[in-house]
Amino acid sequence: LPRWRQQWSGSGTTSRFPETVLARCVKYTEVHPEMRHVDCQSVWDAFKGAFISKYPCNITEEDYQPLVKLGTQTVPCNKTLLWSRIKDLAHQFTQVQRDMFTLEDMLLGYLADDLTWCGEFNTFEINYQSCPDWRKDCSNNPVSVFWKTVSRRFAETACGVVHVMLNGSRSKIFDKNSTFGSVEVHNLQPEKVQALEAWVIHGGREDSRDLCQDPTIKELESIISKRNIRFFCKNIYRPDKFLQCVKNPEDSSCLSG
Protein backbone atom coordinates (compact mmCIF):
# COMPACT_ATOMS: atom_id res chain seq x y z
CA LEU A 1 0.00 0.00 0.00
CA PRO A 2 1.27 3.52 -0.79
CA ARG A 3 2.35 5.31 2.35
CA TRP A 4 0.02 8.13 3.44
CA ARG A 5 1.18 11.52 2.27
CA GLN A 6 0.24 15.01 3.39
CA GLN A 7 -1.98 16.53 0.72
CA TRP A 8 -1.32 20.20 0.03
CA SER A 9 -3.14 22.62 -2.24
CA GLY A 10 -0.13 23.53 -4.37
CA SER A 11 1.61 21.60 -7.12
CA GLY A 12 4.24 19.11 -6.04
CA THR A 13 8.01 19.27 -6.34
CA THR A 14 9.21 19.85 -9.89
CA SER A 15 10.02 16.58 -11.64
CA ARG A 16 13.70 15.54 -11.33
CA PHE A 17 14.32 18.37 -8.87
CA PRO A 18 17.70 17.14 -7.50
CA GLU A 19 19.04 16.47 -11.00
CA THR A 20 17.81 19.87 -12.20
CA VAL A 21 19.45 21.77 -9.34
CA LEU A 22 22.73 19.90 -9.78
CA ALA A 23 22.73 20.35 -13.57
CA ARG A 24 21.93 24.05 -13.26
CA CYS A 25 24.75 24.47 -10.74
CA VAL A 26 27.29 22.79 -13.02
CA LYS A 27 26.11 24.87 -15.97
CA TYR A 28 26.36 28.05 -13.90
CA THR A 29 29.96 27.32 -12.87
CA GLU A 30 30.86 26.61 -16.49
CA VAL A 31 29.39 29.92 -17.70
CA HIS A 32 30.82 31.95 -14.78
CA PRO A 33 34.56 31.23 -14.52
CA GLU A 34 34.78 33.11 -11.21
CA MET A 35 32.65 30.29 -9.75
CA ARG A 36 34.86 27.54 -11.17
CA HIS A 37 35.84 26.27 -7.72
CA VAL A 38 32.28 25.62 -6.57
CA ASP A 39 31.52 22.02 -5.62
CA CYS A 40 27.94 21.61 -6.80
CA GLN A 41 27.40 18.46 -4.76
CA SER A 42 28.04 20.53 -1.61
CA VAL A 43 25.59 23.16 -2.84
CA TRP A 44 22.93 20.51 -3.40
CA ASP A 45 23.59 18.96 0.03
CA ALA A 46 23.05 22.37 1.66
CA PHE A 47 19.92 23.01 -0.42
CA LYS A 48 18.51 19.61 0.47
CA GLY A 49 19.33 20.11 4.14
CA ALA A 50 17.12 23.18 4.26
CA PHE A 51 13.86 21.33 3.65
CA ILE A 52 14.29 17.53 3.70
CA SER A 53 12.74 15.82 6.75
CA LYS A 54 11.16 19.10 7.87
CA TYR A 55 7.50 19.94 8.20
CA PRO A 56 6.91 22.02 5.06
CA CYS A 57 4.79 24.64 6.81
CA ASN A 58 7.40 25.35 9.43
CA ILE A 59 10.43 26.31 7.35
CA THR A 60 12.49 29.25 8.61
CA GLU A 61 15.11 31.54 7.10
CA GLU A 62 17.53 29.88 9.51
CA ASP A 63 17.03 26.60 7.64
CA TYR A 64 18.48 28.22 4.52
CA GLN A 65 21.47 29.87 6.22
CA PRO A 66 23.94 27.06 5.37
CA LEU A 67 22.94 27.37 1.71
CA VAL A 68 23.06 31.18 1.75
CA LYS A 69 26.52 31.08 3.35
CA LEU A 70 27.70 28.83 0.55
CA GLY A 71 26.22 30.97 -2.20
CA THR A 72 28.00 34.21 -1.36
CA GLN A 73 28.35 36.34 -4.47
CA THR A 74 28.68 40.07 -4.67
CA VAL A 75 27.23 42.34 -7.33
CA PRO A 76 29.32 45.40 -8.25
CA CYS A 77 27.88 48.72 -7.10
CA ASN A 78 25.26 50.24 -9.44
CA LYS A 79 24.66 46.87 -11.10
CA THR A 80 21.73 45.43 -9.10
CA LEU A 81 18.40 45.15 -10.91
CA LEU A 82 15.34 44.33 -8.81
CA TRP A 83 11.98 43.62 -10.43
CA SER A 84 8.35 43.18 -9.49
CA ARG A 85 5.73 41.39 -11.59
CA ILE A 86 7.84 41.78 -14.75
CA LYS A 87 10.43 39.02 -14.51
CA ASP A 88 10.69 38.18 -18.22
CA LEU A 89 11.61 41.69 -19.34
CA ALA A 90 14.07 42.09 -16.44
CA HIS A 91 15.80 38.88 -17.51
CA GLN A 92 15.78 39.86 -21.18
CA PHE A 93 17.44 43.10 -20.13
CA THR A 94 20.26 41.48 -18.12
CA GLN A 95 20.85 38.97 -20.91
CA VAL A 96 21.71 41.95 -23.12
CA GLN A 97 23.19 44.26 -20.47
CA ARG A 98 25.55 41.58 -19.16
CA ASP A 99 27.04 43.73 -16.43
CA MET A 100 23.73 44.10 -14.59
CA PHE A 101 22.28 41.37 -12.41
CA THR A 102 18.90 40.23 -11.17
CA LEU A 103 18.63 37.73 -8.33
CA GLU A 104 18.09 34.98 -10.92
CA ASP A 105 21.45 35.84 -12.51
CA MET A 106 23.14 34.87 -9.23
CA LEU A 107 23.87 31.23 -8.40
CA LEU A 108 21.11 30.62 -5.83
CA GLY A 109 18.44 32.45 -7.81
CA TYR A 110 19.49 30.65 -10.96
CA LEU A 111 19.25 27.26 -9.24
CA ALA A 112 15.70 27.77 -7.99
CA ASP A 113 14.09 29.91 -10.71
CA ASP A 114 10.63 28.54 -11.65
CA LEU A 115 11.07 25.41 -9.51
CA THR A 116 8.87 24.08 -6.70
CA TRP A 117 10.04 21.82 -3.90
CA CYS A 118 9.08 20.46 -0.49
CA GLY A 119 9.80 17.49 1.71
CA GLU A 120 7.92 15.65 4.42
CA PHE A 121 8.35 15.65 8.16
CA ASN A 122 10.59 12.85 9.42
CA THR A 123 11.26 11.21 6.06
CA PHE A 124 14.09 11.71 3.60
CA GLU A 125 11.66 11.82 0.71
CA ILE A 126 10.82 14.69 -1.60
CA ASN A 127 7.09 15.25 -2.11
CA TYR A 128 6.38 15.16 -5.83
CA GLN A 129 2.58 15.02 -5.32
CA SER A 130 1.84 18.35 -3.64
CA CYS A 131 3.47 21.23 -1.78
CA PRO A 132 1.95 23.95 0.41
CA ASP A 133 0.30 26.84 -1.37
CA TRP A 134 1.23 30.28 0.03
CA ARG A 135 -2.41 31.40 0.38
CA LYS A 136 -4.34 28.19 0.94
CA ASP A 137 -1.88 26.35 3.17
CA CYS A 138 0.91 28.42 4.73
CA SER A 139 3.43 31.15 4.00
CA ASN A 140 6.34 29.43 5.76
CA ASN A 141 6.77 26.86 3.02
CA PRO A 142 10.14 25.88 1.50
CA VAL A 143 9.79 27.88 -1.72
CA SER A 144 8.41 31.10 -0.20
CA VAL A 145 10.95 31.12 2.61
CA PHE A 146 13.76 30.47 0.13
CA TRP A 147 12.84 33.48 -2.00
CA LYS A 148 12.33 35.66 1.06
CA THR A 149 15.75 34.65 2.39
CA VAL A 150 17.73 35.10 -0.82
CA SER A 151 15.84 38.29 -1.75
CA ARG A 152 16.66 39.80 1.64
CA ARG A 153 20.32 38.90 1.19
CA PHE A 154 20.37 40.23 -2.38
CA ALA A 155 18.94 43.58 -1.25
CA GLU A 156 21.25 43.78 1.77
CA THR A 157 24.35 43.43 -0.38
CA ALA A 158 23.27 45.96 -3.04
CA CYS A 159 25.21 49.23 -3.26
CA GLY A 160 25.34 52.43 -5.26
CA VAL A 161 22.32 53.18 -7.43
CA VAL A 162 19.87 50.26 -7.38
CA HIS A 163 17.40 49.85 -10.23
CA VAL A 164 13.96 48.27 -10.08
CA MET A 165 11.73 47.34 -13.00
CA LEU A 166 8.00 47.69 -12.26
CA ASN A 167 5.01 46.61 -14.31
CA GLY A 168 2.99 49.68 -15.34
CA SER A 169 0.10 47.50 -16.54
CA ARG A 170 -0.75 46.30 -13.03
CA SER A 171 -3.41 48.00 -10.92
CA LYS A 172 -0.77 48.32 -8.20
CA ILE A 173 2.43 49.29 -9.99
CA PHE A 174 4.17 49.15 -6.64
CA ASP A 175 2.68 46.43 -4.47
CA LYS A 176 3.63 46.45 -0.78
CA ASN A 177 2.82 42.72 -0.64
CA SER A 178 5.22 41.70 -3.42
CA THR A 179 8.69 40.38 -2.59
CA PHE A 180 10.09 43.71 -3.72
CA GLY A 181 7.63 45.68 -1.60
CA SER A 182 7.72 43.52 1.52
CA VAL A 183 11.33 42.34 1.59
CA GLU A 184 13.75 44.06 -0.77
CA VAL A 185 12.68 47.68 -0.21
CA HIS A 186 13.14 47.29 3.55
CA ASN A 187 16.54 45.62 3.29
CA LEU A 188 18.34 48.11 1.09
CA GLN A 189 21.08 49.57 3.28
CA PRO A 190 21.01 53.40 3.33
CA GLU A 191 24.71 53.57 4.18
CA LYS A 192 25.52 51.67 0.96
CA VAL A 193 22.66 52.57 -1.39
CA GLN A 194 22.59 56.17 -2.62
CA ALA A 195 19.44 55.91 -4.72
CA LEU A 196 16.69 53.67 -6.01
CA GLU A 197 15.73 54.27 -9.63
CA ALA A 198 12.38 52.80 -10.69
CA TRP A 199 11.73 51.99 -14.32
CA VAL A 200 7.98 51.83 -14.90
CA ILE A 201 7.33 49.64 -17.93
CA HIS A 202 4.30 50.64 -20.00
CA GLY A 203 2.11 47.97 -21.55
CA GLY A 204 0.07 49.72 -24.23
CA ARG A 205 1.68 51.32 -27.27
CA GLU A 206 -0.47 54.45 -27.00
CA ASP A 207 -0.02 54.81 -23.26
CA SER A 208 1.66 58.19 -22.83
CA ARG A 209 0.67 58.80 -19.19
CA ASP A 210 3.34 59.65 -16.67
CA LEU A 211 3.06 56.54 -14.50
CA CYS A 212 5.71 57.95 -12.20
CA GLN A 213 2.88 60.04 -10.77
CA ASP A 214 0.87 56.91 -9.88
CA PRO A 215 -0.18 56.89 -6.19
CA THR A 216 1.61 53.60 -5.55
CA ILE A 217 4.85 55.02 -6.96
CA LYS A 218 4.44 58.02 -4.68
CA GLU A 219 4.01 55.54 -1.84
CA LEU A 220 7.25 53.81 -2.86
CA GLU A 221 9.00 57.18 -3.02
CA SER A 222 7.79 57.96 0.49
CA ILE A 223 9.03 54.62 1.90
CA ILE A 224 12.42 54.99 0.22
CA SER A 225 12.86 58.65 1.19
CA LYS A 226 12.07 57.86 4.82
CA ARG A 227 14.94 55.38 4.69
CA ASN A 228 17.30 58.19 3.58
CA ILE A 229 17.66 56.79 0.07
CA ARG A 230 17.06 59.08 -2.88
CA PHE A 231 14.35 58.07 -5.34
CA PHE A 232 14.14 58.53 -9.10
CA CYS A 233 11.55 57.28 -11.55
CA LYS A 234 11.54 56.83 -15.33
CA ASN A 235 8.76 55.86 -17.69
CA ILE A 236 9.72 53.19 -20.23
CA TYR A 237 7.00 53.84 -22.81
CA ARG A 238 8.22 51.31 -25.37
CA PRO A 239 9.82 48.25 -23.76
CA ASP A 240 10.55 46.72 -27.18
CA LYS A 241 12.46 49.86 -28.23
CA PHE A 242 14.08 50.03 -24.80
CA LEU A 243 15.55 46.54 -25.25
CA GLN A 244 16.54 47.28 -28.84
CA CYS A 245 18.41 50.40 -27.71
CA VAL A 246 20.21 48.44 -25.00
CA LYS A 247 21.34 46.02 -27.72
CA ASN A 248 22.24 48.77 -30.22
CA PRO A 249 22.79 52.06 -28.39
CA GLU A 250 24.28 53.63 -31.55
CA ASP A 251 21.01 53.19 -33.47
CA SER A 252 19.83 56.62 -34.69
CA SER A 253 16.40 56.18 -33.09
CA CYS A 254 18.09 55.67 -29.71
CA LEU A 255 20.28 58.75 -29.72
CA SER A 256 17.48 61.30 -29.23
CA GLY A 257 16.89 61.93 -25.49
Partner: antibody, heavy 118, light 110 residues
Framework: QVQLVESGGGLVKPGGSLRLSCAAS????????MSWIRQAPGKGLEWVAS????????YYADSVRGRFTISRDNAKNSLYLQMNSLRAEDTAVYYC???????????WGRGTLVTVSS | QAGLTQPPSASGTSGQRVTISCSGS????????VYWYQHLPGTAPKLLIY???QRPSGVPDRFSGSKSGNSASLAISGLRSEDEADYYC???????????FGSGTKVTVL
Protein backbone atom coordinates in the same frame (compact mmCIF):
# COMPACT_ATOMS: atom_id res chain seq x y z
CA GLN B 1 53.88 20.04 -23.72
CA VAL B 2 53.15 22.80 -21.22
CA GLN B 3 56.16 24.80 -20.09
CA LEU B 4 56.30 27.60 -17.51
CA VAL B 5 59.62 29.32 -16.90
CA GLU B 6 60.00 31.93 -14.18
CA SER B 7 62.69 34.61 -14.14
CA GLY B 8 63.51 37.88 -12.39
CA GLY B 9 64.29 36.59 -8.90
CA GLY B 10 67.30 37.76 -6.92
CA LEU B 11 68.53 39.60 -3.86
CA VAL B 12 66.78 42.85 -2.96
CA LYS B 13 66.84 45.15 0.07
CA PRO B 14 63.74 45.61 2.28
CA GLY B 15 61.50 48.29 0.78
CA GLY B 16 62.85 47.53 -2.68
CA SER B 17 61.07 46.30 -5.81
CA LEU B 18 61.37 43.36 -8.15
CA ARG B 19 59.45 42.19 -11.21
CA LEU B 20 59.03 38.48 -11.84
CA SER B 21 58.17 37.09 -15.28
CA CYS B 22 56.79 33.76 -16.38
CA ALA B 23 57.12 32.66 -19.99
CA ALA B 24 54.41 30.20 -21.00
CA SER B 25 54.27 27.78 -23.92
CA UNK B 26 52.50 24.60 -24.99
CA UNK B 27 48.94 25.80 -24.37
CA UNK B 28 46.59 28.66 -25.31
CA UNK B 29 47.81 31.12 -22.70
CA UNK B 30 44.97 33.63 -23.15
CA UNK B 31 42.34 30.97 -22.29
CA UNK B 32 43.53 30.20 -18.78
CA UNK B 33 43.64 31.76 -15.34
CA MET B 34 47.24 32.10 -14.12
CA SER B 35 48.64 32.35 -10.60
CA TRP B 36 51.71 32.96 -8.48
CA ILE B 37 52.35 30.70 -5.48
CA ARG B 38 55.33 30.93 -3.15
CA GLN B 39 57.20 28.85 -0.61
CA ALA B 40 59.28 30.51 2.09
CA PRO B 41 62.34 28.59 3.37
CA GLY B 42 61.19 25.76 5.63
CA LYS B 43 57.53 26.74 5.21
CA GLY B 44 54.55 25.50 3.21
CA LEU B 45 53.02 26.65 -0.05
CA GLU B 46 51.22 30.01 0.00
CA TRP B 47 49.01 31.35 -2.78
CA VAL B 48 49.99 34.91 -3.74
CA ALA B 49 47.82 36.13 -6.61
CA SER B 50 45.72 35.06 -9.61
CA UNK B 51 44.62 36.76 -12.80
CA UNK B 52 41.63 35.71 -14.88
CA UNK B 53 41.42 35.20 -18.62
CA UNK B 54 39.39 37.61 -20.78
CA UNK B 55 39.10 41.11 -19.35
CA UNK B 56 41.46 40.42 -16.46
CA UNK B 57 40.21 40.30 -12.90
CA UNK B 58 42.93 40.08 -10.27
CA TYR B 59 42.89 38.37 -6.86
CA TYR B 60 45.45 38.78 -4.09
CA ALA B 61 46.37 37.22 -0.76
CA ASP B 62 45.90 39.63 2.16
CA SER B 63 49.63 39.44 2.87
CA VAL B 64 50.56 41.07 -0.48
CA ARG B 65 47.49 43.17 -1.38
CA GLY B 66 48.47 46.76 -2.17
CA ARG B 67 52.16 45.86 -2.60
CA PHE B 68 52.14 43.26 -5.39
CA THR B 69 50.51 43.53 -8.82
CA ILE B 70 49.81 40.54 -11.05
CA SER B 71 49.42 41.16 -14.77
CA ARG B 72 49.57 39.32 -18.07
CA ASP B 73 50.47 40.01 -21.68
CA ASN B 74 48.60 37.52 -23.85
CA ALA B 75 50.43 38.66 -26.98
CA LYS B 76 53.73 37.68 -25.35
CA ASN B 77 52.39 34.60 -23.53
CA SER B 78 53.75 36.10 -20.34
CA LEU B 79 52.67 36.47 -16.73
CA TYR B 80 54.17 39.08 -14.40
CA LEU B 81 54.38 39.86 -10.71
CA GLN B 82 55.44 43.38 -9.79
CA MET B 83 56.59 43.33 -6.16
CA ASN B 84 56.97 46.63 -4.32
CA SER B 85 57.71 47.51 -0.68
CA LEU B 86 59.34 44.14 -0.22
CA ARG B 87 59.76 42.72 3.27
CA ALA B 88 61.97 39.99 4.74
CA GLU B 89 58.92 37.73 5.00
CA ASP B 90 58.51 37.87 1.19
CA THR B 91 61.68 35.79 0.86
CA ALA B 92 60.59 32.63 -0.96
CA VAL B 93 60.69 30.57 -4.11
CA TYR B 94 57.97 31.99 -6.39
CA TYR B 95 56.17 29.57 -8.69
CA CYS B 96 54.10 30.44 -11.72
CA UNK B 97 51.13 28.08 -12.18
CA UNK B 98 48.41 27.49 -14.72
CA UNK B 99 44.87 26.94 -13.47
CA UNK B 100 42.56 24.48 -15.15
CA UNK B 101 38.79 24.76 -15.43
CA UNK B 102 37.97 23.46 -11.95
CA UNK B 103 40.46 25.79 -10.27
CA UNK B 104 43.27 23.26 -9.89
CA UNK B 105 46.91 24.19 -10.59
CA UNK B 106 47.70 21.66 -13.28
CA UNK B 107 51.09 22.96 -14.38
CA TRP B 108 53.86 24.64 -12.40
CA GLY B 109 57.20 26.24 -13.22
CA ARG B 110 60.41 25.28 -11.41
CA GLY B 111 60.33 28.53 -9.43
CA THR B 112 62.56 31.58 -8.99
CA LEU B 113 64.12 32.55 -5.67
CA VAL B 114 63.48 36.00 -4.21
CA THR B 115 65.63 37.00 -1.21
CA VAL B 116 64.79 40.16 0.71
CA SER B 117 67.65 41.05 3.01
CA SER B 118 69.71 44.06 3.99
CA GLN C 1 45.39 34.45 6.38
CA ALA C 2 44.04 31.32 8.08
CA GLY C 3 44.86 28.25 6.04
CA LEU C 4 43.62 24.67 6.12
CA THR C 5 44.68 22.38 8.94
CA GLN C 6 46.82 19.30 8.22
CA PRO C 7 48.87 17.07 10.51
CA PRO C 8 52.57 17.94 10.21
CA SER C 9 53.62 14.35 9.55
CA ALA C 10 52.39 10.88 8.66
CA SER C 11 54.29 7.65 8.20
CA GLY C 12 53.89 4.04 7.30
CA THR C 13 55.86 1.04 6.19
CA SER C 14 56.12 0.06 2.56
CA GLY C 15 52.83 -1.38 1.32
CA GLN C 16 50.78 0.19 4.10
CA ARG C 17 47.91 2.67 3.76
CA VAL C 18 48.37 6.23 4.99
CA THR C 19 45.61 8.84 5.33
CA ILE C 20 46.15 12.59 5.58
CA SER C 21 43.35 14.79 6.88
CA CYS C 22 42.61 18.37 5.87
CA SER C 23 40.21 20.48 7.88
CA GLY C 24 38.65 23.76 6.77
CA SER C 25 35.43 25.72 7.04
CA UNK C 26 32.15 26.36 5.22
CA UNK C 27 33.75 29.17 3.20
CA UNK C 28 36.45 26.95 1.68
CA UNK C 29 36.16 23.15 1.77
CA UNK C 30 32.45 23.36 2.67
CA UNK C 31 31.45 24.90 -0.67
CA UNK C 32 34.45 24.54 -2.97
CA UNK C 33 36.53 21.78 -4.50
CA VAL C 34 39.54 20.37 -2.68
CA TYR C 35 42.88 19.84 -4.44
CA TRP C 36 45.91 17.85 -3.31
CA TYR C 37 49.52 18.51 -4.36
CA GLN C 38 52.69 16.46 -3.91
CA HIS C 39 55.90 18.40 -3.46
CA LEU C 40 59.41 17.00 -3.49
CA PRO C 41 62.14 19.46 -2.40
CA GLY C 42 63.78 21.24 -5.33
CA THR C 43 61.05 20.29 -7.81
CA ALA C 44 57.81 21.85 -8.98
CA PRO C 45 54.71 20.80 -7.01
CA LYS C 46 52.55 18.21 -8.76
CA LEU C 47 48.75 17.99 -8.87
CA LEU C 48 47.60 14.68 -7.34
CA ILE C 49 43.85 15.13 -6.85
CA TYR C 50 41.40 17.72 -8.19
CA UNK C 51 37.67 18.27 -7.66
CA UNK C 52 37.82 16.34 -4.34
CA UNK C 53 38.46 12.89 -5.79
CA GLN C 54 39.56 13.11 -9.43
CA ARG C 55 43.01 11.93 -10.47
CA PRO C 56 44.85 13.55 -13.39
CA SER C 57 46.16 11.09 -15.97
CA GLY C 58 49.46 9.63 -14.88
CA VAL C 59 48.66 9.70 -11.16
CA PRO C 60 48.51 6.12 -9.82
CA ASP C 61 45.19 4.88 -8.45
CA ARG C 62 46.96 4.28 -5.13
CA PHE C 63 46.12 7.95 -4.47
CA SER C 64 42.51 8.75 -3.64
CA GLY C 65 40.73 11.78 -2.28
CA SER C 66 37.45 12.29 -0.47
CA LYS C 67 35.50 15.15 1.06
CA SER C 68 32.80 15.35 3.71
CA GLY C 69 31.40 18.61 5.01
CA ASN C 70 34.25 20.95 5.89
CA SER C 71 36.95 18.27 5.84
CA ALA C 72 38.82 16.27 3.23
CA SER C 73 41.33 13.48 3.21
CA LEU C 74 43.98 11.97 0.96
CA ALA C 75 44.66 8.25 1.15
CA ILE C 76 47.80 6.59 -0.17
CA SER C 77 47.49 2.82 -0.34
CA GLY C 78 50.35 0.47 -1.05
CA LEU C 79 52.87 3.03 0.18
CA ARG C 80 56.14 3.16 -1.79
CA SER C 81 59.47 4.83 -1.12
CA GLU C 82 58.91 7.33 -3.96
CA ASP C 83 55.83 8.61 -2.09
CA GLU C 84 58.09 10.29 0.47
CA ALA C 85 57.21 13.95 -0.02
CA ASP C 86 55.26 16.89 1.36
CA TYR C 87 51.52 16.80 0.63
CA TYR C 88 49.34 19.91 0.57
CA CYS C 89 45.59 20.29 0.41
CA UNK C 90 44.13 23.49 -1.04
CA UNK C 91 40.76 25.08 -1.72
CA UNK C 92 39.35 28.42 -2.82
CA UNK C 93 38.04 30.47 0.11
CA UNK C 94 34.98 32.58 -0.69
CA UNK C 95 35.40 34.91 2.26
CA UNK C 96 39.01 35.69 1.30
CA UNK C 97 38.47 35.57 -2.48
CA UNK C 98 41.62 33.52 -2.74
CA UNK C 99 43.15 30.08 -2.40
CA UNK C 100 44.14 28.67 0.96
CA PHE C 101 46.67 25.87 1.34
CA GLY C 102 47.09 23.44 4.17
CA SER C 103 50.26 23.68 6.24
CA GLY C 104 51.58 20.53 4.57
CA THR C 105 52.09 16.95 5.75
CA LYS C 106 55.47 15.25 5.46
CA VAL C 107 55.00 11.58 4.57
CA THR C 108 57.79 9.23 5.57
CA VAL C 109 58.12 5.62 4.45
CA LEU C 110 59.63 3.61 7.30
Amino acid sequence: QVQLVESGGGLVKPGGSLRLSCAASGFTFSDDYMSWIRQAPGKGLEWVASVSNGRPTTYYADSVRGRFTISRDNAKNSLYLQMNSLRAEDTAVYYCAREDWGGEFTDWGRGTLVTVSS
Amino acid sequence: QAGLTQPPSASGTSGQRVTISCSGSSSNIGINFVYWYQHLPGTAPKLLIYKNNQRPSGVPDRFSGSKSGNSASLAISGLRSEDEADYYCAAWDDSLSGYVFGSGTKVTVL
